[in-house]
Interface confidence: low
């Protein structure tokens, strides 16, 4: 069936439309286009004869139409009048006619709309505002946007006049937003510039900050007032009802008790004509003197001297408080407070008592703190430590030893090598060492205030080849299921790998085995008798690898539940009873026997010759391990038949 399709159906003025023909019959003579829904010679636009390929304009031809060989018709530069129906008349070669009708609609391109308002400065909770979208256009749809969102649902928002007018009833400050309108028709959509609604409101009840109402004499009073308001509020300050100034902030330096009173902030909005006030009551307290600490001993000696700290000045009916290290006083027998808490005494000071110490005086408003006081406790020197802890060094490296001893005042240091004084410094540095630098290195620390000296000696060996290592142990006889043992591979050397073997095998994976200290220390937790093995450590560096002699762990265990043998419990009268008791234990346990609860002998074997029914009863073997402190026993019933 012959059909006409309009592309597009809705056409904008000035654009073009194509009337596209579908299912055009075969064997045509020609065809004509007419304006309207029927064939009318007066309304012919154009005719076309296929044989001659000749197009002939008709009375309705405007010069804007182009006919194509496939019978489609293009109309350019569309005007409003072009809206409507178009009929195609097809004449076939057999002179049989066929007709088809198509249509399109013409719409104008919309102009950019604008918003008019009936009230440019509405007052909150009082006025309404009507926005109207201009111009009024036929066949146009009107839409509204608030802050680029579609209109919210609200009983205070109402659309009218075909949605061209948006009315906001009883405006609030929250209606201060960006409003836009949009016009749409089938061929165009245009959005207006935004209009910002300026809602007049306030002032709200002002807030005065800061909130605190208590001040000390000598401080500055700086009050700030703020009230939500549009346009911004004008502020006035009143003290005890008397006008002070028209500013948002009130500043009074170096206040006294006389500045106590009621402070009123008044906020005024000139556009709404409204006033709001807020009152705060300020109290100014007299300033007490700042406390300070005095001491009866400025340089106490550790473990010798006591120190009494006193909080000054002395004021009647005052509470004194103390702090050490910014904490309240710890409970300690070495800390004593006087009855009025004004004096704090430290008995037998230690280096940890340095402080800082603060005292405080409490008044109605706050606590006044003294400046902190630090005690200069004289101590030391302790035994010096030489670092690093390595004892073996490779030739060619630099030897840098540092000595430190805890001391106040700081210790003075001296270094000796093989008993010969070298230098009076904390650090000893020897570059590019050789085997000849091996020897005894002594650090001496001296405290000039106490006159005390302490020394530490370290043996240093310079060698490319590591020595054969050895194993040291922190527990030579650990108890099973109780003790831990830490094996350490000696010596400690720079850039060295430490390895361990147990019974010639690498370490088994076990939660009870832990390597630490760069694998130099092997710790066995909760030892068991199965840990009584041969332990070997190995050391490696870039030039050598050596293993220690094995160390066998001697685990103390037991005694386990003893076993009495032979297992027989029935004997014939006249036989010899020979009971042997055995309990797994390290060291071997002490054995004792009881027959029917009566102690017998302290031997492993109990022998009774020629037993009789009188020997019936309970035979108990008791075992005791003095090293583990543990005991065990077992009871066996013996029956002798006549």
């Amino acid at each position: 069936k012959l059909t006409i399709e309009s592309t597009p159906f809705n056409v904008a003025e000035g654009k073009e439309v194509l009337l596209l023909v579908h299912n055009l019959p075969q064997h045509l003579f020609g065809y004509s286009w007419y304006k309207g829904e029927r064939v009318d010679g007066n309304r012919q636009i154009i005719g076309y004869v296929i044989g001659t390929q000749q197009a002939t304009p008709g009375p309705a031809y405007s010069g804007r139409e182009i006919i194509y060989p496939n019978a489609s018709l293009l109309i350019q530069n569309i005007i409003q009048n072009d809206t409507g129906f178009y009929t195609l008349h097809v004449i076939k070669s057999d002179l049989v006619n066929e007709e088809a009708t198509g249509q399109f609609r013409v719409y104008p391109e919309l102009p950019k709309p604008s918003i008019s308002s009936n009230n440019s400065k509405p007052v909150e909770d009082k006025d309404a505002v009507a926005f109207t979208c201009e111009p009024e256009t036929q066949d146009a749809t009107y839409l509204w946007w608030v802050n680029n969102q579609s209109l919210p649902v609200s009983p205070r928002l109402q659309l009218s006049n075909g949605n061209r007018t948006l009315t906001l009833f009883n405006v609030t400050r929250n209606d201060t937003a960006s409003y836009k309108c949009e016009t749409q028709n089938p061929v165009s959509a245009r959005r207006s510039d935004s209009v910002i609604l300026n809602v007049l409101y306030g002032p709200d009840a002002p807030t005065i900050s800061p909130l605190n109402t208590s001040y000390r004499s000598g401080e500055n009073l700086n009050l700030s007032c703020h009230a939500a308001s549009n346009p911004p509020a004008q502020y006035s300050w009143f003290v005890n009802g008397t006008f002070q100034q028209s500013t948002q902030e009130l500043f009074i330096p170096n206040i006294t008790v006389n500045n106590s009173g009621s402070y009123t902030c008044q906020a005024h909005n000139s556009d709404t004509g409204l006033n709001r006030t807020t009152v705060t009551t300020i109290t100014v307290y007299a300033e007490p003197p700042k406390p300070f600490i005095t001491s009866n001993n400025s340089n106490p000696v550790e473990d010798e001297d006591a120190v009494a700290l006193t909080c000054e000045p002395e004021i009647q009916n005052t509470t004194y408080l103390w702090w050490v290290n910014n904490q309240s006083l710890p409970v300690s027998p070495r800390l004593q407070l006087s009855n009025d808490n004004r004096t704090l005494t430290l008995l037998s000071v230690t280096r940890n008592d340095v402080g800082p110490y603060e005292c405080g005086i409490q008044n109605e408003l706050s606590v006044d703190h003294s400046d902190p006081v630090i005690l200069n406790v004289l101590y030391g020197p302790d035994d010096p430590t030489i670092s690093p802890s390595y004892t073996y060094y490779r030739p060619g490296v630099n030897l840098s030893l540092s000595c430190h001893a805890a001391s106040n005042p700081p210790a003075q240091y001296s270094w000796l090598i093989d008993g010969n004084i070298q230098q009076h410094t904390q650090e000893l540095f020897i570059s590019n060492i050789t085997e000849k630098n091996s020897g005894l290195y002594t650090c001496q620390a001296n405290n000039s205030a106490s006159g005390h000296s302490r020394t530490t000696v370290k043996t240093i060996t310079v060698s490319a080849e590591l020595p054969k290592p050895s194993i040291s142990s922190n527990n030579s006889k650990p108890v099973e299921d109780k003790d831990a043992v830490a094996f350490t591979c000696e010596p400690e050397a720079q850039n060295t790998t430490y390895l361990w073997w147990v019974n010639g095998q690498s370490l088994p994976v076990s939660p009870r085995l832990q390597l630490s200290n760069g694998n130099r220390t092997l710790t066995l937790f909760n030892v068991t008798r199965n840990d009584a093995r041969a332990y070997v450590c190995g050391i490696q560096n870039s030039v050598s690898a050596n293993r220690s002699d094995p160390v066998t762990l001697d685990v103390l265990y037991g005694p386990d539940t003893p076993i009495i043998s032979p297992p027989d419990s029935s004997y014939l009268s006249g036989a010899n009873l020979n009971l042997s008791c055995h309990s797994a234990s390290n060291p071997s346990p002490q054995y004792s026997w009881r027959i029917n609860g009566i102690p017998q002998q302290h031997t492993q074997v109990l022998f009774i010759a020629k037993i009789t029914p009188n020997n019936n009863g309970t035979y108990a073997c008791f075992v005791s391990n003095l090293a583990t402190g543990r005991n065990n026993s077992i009871v066996k019933s013996i029956t002798v038949s006549a």
């Epitope: 490319a464 790998t497 390895l499 690498s506 490696q540 870039s542 030039v543 050598s544 690898a545």
Partner: antibody, heavy 120, light 106 residues
């Protein structure tokens, strides 16, 4: 007994990357160092570096810094070598080796090698 | 890095003949290791820490040297000894190898 099984030969385009694997049996790689080396066609041996599978510590030869990345998966006892930005000069047989910690650090056990060919 | 120079690069020896391969280091090393590689196979350790024979290596192989000069000796060449031999140092990083000595059977 100890065995190091390496992944199969790889043909890679220039600029690409490849990840080689080395699966150990007969020992736990956490107890050892895993070294990687390579040997170009008709060339000598080059040491790429090592990884300590126990803690992930690595040491790379300066030449292979940024080119090679070592990783391990101790659960599968496998070491990996990732090579990136490959060029024709990276065409070589890549070996993994176990550096035993029971003596000095020498190479005891070698994988069979993985041939990597970089084509342009 | 420590450069190891091997000599000769190629040599041939008759069965029963004594073979010596030398390795010179650009910096002093504590020990030298020696590897043997046959075509299509992975290298195999023959001597470690200058003079120690690796497991399964025949006693005709020996090593010596100190400082910067080291050598590998085969007391009596056998057919199965034909291979390329590499020296290797592990005193400093990066670990380095010599360029190799190809030993052929005459």
């Amino acid at each position: 007994q100890v065995k190091l099984q390496q992944s199969g030969a790889e043909l890679v385009k220039s600029g690409g990357s490849v990840k080689l694997s080395c699966t150990a049996s007969g020992f736990n790689i956490k107890d050892s160092y895993m070294h990687w080396l390579r040997q170009g066609p008709e060339q000598g041996l080059e040491w790429i570096g090592w990884i300590d599978p126990e803690n992930g510590d690595t040491e790379y030869a300066p030449k292979f810094q940024g080119k090679a990345t070592f990783t391990t998966d101790t659960s599968s006892n496998t070491a990996y070598l990732q090579l990136s930005s490959l060029t024709s000069e990276d065409t070589a047989v890549y070996y993994c080796n176990e550096g035993t910690p029971t003596g000095p650090y020498y190479f005891d056990y070698w994988g069979q090698g993985t041939t990597v060919t970089v084509s342009s | 890095e420590n450069v190891l120079t091997q000599s000769p690069a190629i040599m041939s020896a008759s069965p029963g003949e004594k073979v010596t391969i030398t390795c010179s280091a650009s910096s002093s090393v504590s020990y030298m290791h020696w590897f043997q590689q046959k075509p299509g196979t992975s290298p195999k350790l023959v001597i470690y820490s200058t003079s120690n024979l690796a497991s399964g290596v025949p006693a005709r192989f020996s090593g010596s040297g100190s400082g910067t000069s080291y050598s590998l000796t085969i007391s009596r060449m056998e057919a199965e000894d034909a291979a390329t031999y590499y020296c290797q140092q592990r005193s400093s990083y990066p670990l380095t190898f010599g360029a190799g000595t190809k030993l052929e059977l005459k």
